[in-house]
């Protein structure tokens, strides 16, 4: 099941989601999608990379603000709406049959409160959900549950790479990405 | 020398079920991943499904998405393609194929000709 | 998801003079960081399956005589028998494995003139 982030409408949410460039600076495609990974690509296309710079965006409110050259690929959608909740996904695709590392995360978008003041706000949902609250432009605010957050190494846990640590030997570690099995 | 031996193919009607084997010798199959590419008759090589090495993780081509499983049994170093709900269309000869790394189709099974008609 | 198309469809060829195959893909197979396109190219001869001849675009897999070669990058390669030979008479396919479910060309058939 996807790692819930929770967001205020108006607010800019953060979706974690990184990989380790092998050697440094040896960048891979990625795609962020709307919908839950589809066997390939992305479904529903918000933001998209090639080895070098972002070359597709379908709104002025998707960002990368992380230090994409070093894989930091974290998705900032900027004054979310309720119409923003659901779950996306972010595609790390590493070249090969089936390559890709995917991971799937819910982002859940709430009305603001009314009266409790903010920082009471993060205290109250992060106690009352184990799940992370995402707030402006700083990334992921504190869990409350330790180790609910994913890991955002990526973990490779699908098909062609989940196997054969001995075959995917230096054509992979020229691919581009740190691979590292679960 | 690395092998692959398949069976299970014959002739079928629409809506019908068949299962594909392949048998592994020559090296350790839950060491690769492996795929079954199809040939229609006096046609080119369509990708169809793949598994990872251990099974846990397997891919379907969106043509038999739904229909078609693809499995493996380390223990007997075999690898399967159930199929379900056959179509016309589906008519060709199957080949399991090994994958090198996570790259190209090093060693490729003799075929097996799956016919779906009435 | 990417398309391979090949051309010609098919070409005869006298015994011992050259056969030039080419294959484009739909976008760049290159990955610029390791600087290798992620193509392969197959032989298939009448009622056998295919058989690997070259990947990574100009790799020979063991035992092909060195009388094939491939060569392009980016989305246009090229599969060259230097000198044609009666053995030779199959259909060849190019195919990607840079991303997405792997593709094949549709196939090109070498024959004798």
């Known amino acids: 099941s996807e790692v819930e982030y929770i967001a205020e409408v108006g607010q800019n949410a953060y979706l974690p989601c990184s990989y380790t460039p092998a050697p440094p600076g040896n960048l891979v495609p990625v795609c962020w999608g709307k919908g839950a990974c589809p066997v390939f690509d992305c479904s529903n296309v918000v933001l998209r990379t090639d080895n070098r710079d972002v070359n597709d965006r379908t709104s002025g409110r998707y960002w990368l603000k992380g230090d994409f050259h070093k894989g930091d690929v974290s998705l900032t959608i900027e004054n979310v709406t309720l119409a923003d909740s659901g779950v996306y996904c972010c595609r790390i695709q590493i070249p090969g049959i089936m390559n890709d590392e995917k991971h799937n995360v819910k982002l859940v978008v709430i009305k603001p409160a009314k009266v409790t003041p903010a920082p009471t706000l993060q205290r109250d949902l992060t106690s009352a959900f184990p799940r992370m609250l995402t707030t402006g432009e700083h990334g992921p605010a504190e869990t409350q549950t330790p180790g609910s957050l994913p890991d955002v190494n990526l973990t490779v846990s699908n098909f062609f790479c989940e196997l054969q640590i001995f075959t995917l030997t230096n054509e992979l570690r020229d691919s581009g990405a740190t691979i590292r099995t679960a | 020398q690395v092998q692959l031996q398949q069976s299970g193919g014959g002739l079928v009607q629409p809506g019908g079920s068949l299962r594909l084997s392949c048998a592994a010798s020559g090296f350790t199959l839950s060491s690769y991943a492996m795929s079954w590419v199809r040939q229609a008759p006096g046609k080119g090589l369509e990708w169809v499904s793949g598994?990872?090495?251990?099974?846990?993780?397997?891919y379907n081509a969106d043509s038999v998405k739904g229909r078609f499983t693809i499995s493996r049994d380390n223990s007997k170093n075999t690898l399967f393609l159930q199929m379900n709900s056959l179509r016309a269309e589906d008519t060709a000869v199957y080949y399991c194929a090994k994958i090198f790394g996570s790259y190209y189709f090093d060693y490729w099974g003799q075929g097996t000709l799956v016919t779906v008609s009435s | 998801e990417i398309v391979m198309t090949q051309s010609p469809d098919s070409l005869a060829v006298s015994l011992g003079e050259r056969a030039t195959i080419n294959c484009k893909s739909s976008q760049s197979v290159l990955y610029s960081s390791n600087n290798k396109n992620y193509l392969a190219w197959y032989q298939q001869k009448p009622g056998q399956p295919p058989k690997l001849l070259i990947y990574?675009?100009?790799t020979r897999e063991s035992g092909v005589p060195n009388r094939f070669s491939g060569s392009g990058s980016g989305t246009d390669f090229t599969l060259t028998i230097s000198s044609l030979q009666a053995e030779d008479v199959a259909v060849y396919y190019c195919q990607q494995y840079y991303s997405g479910p792997p593709t094949f060309g549709q196939g090109t058939k070498v024959e004798i003139k």
């Open positions: 990574w675009t100009s």
């Open positions: 598994i990872s090495g251990s099974g846990g993780s397997t």
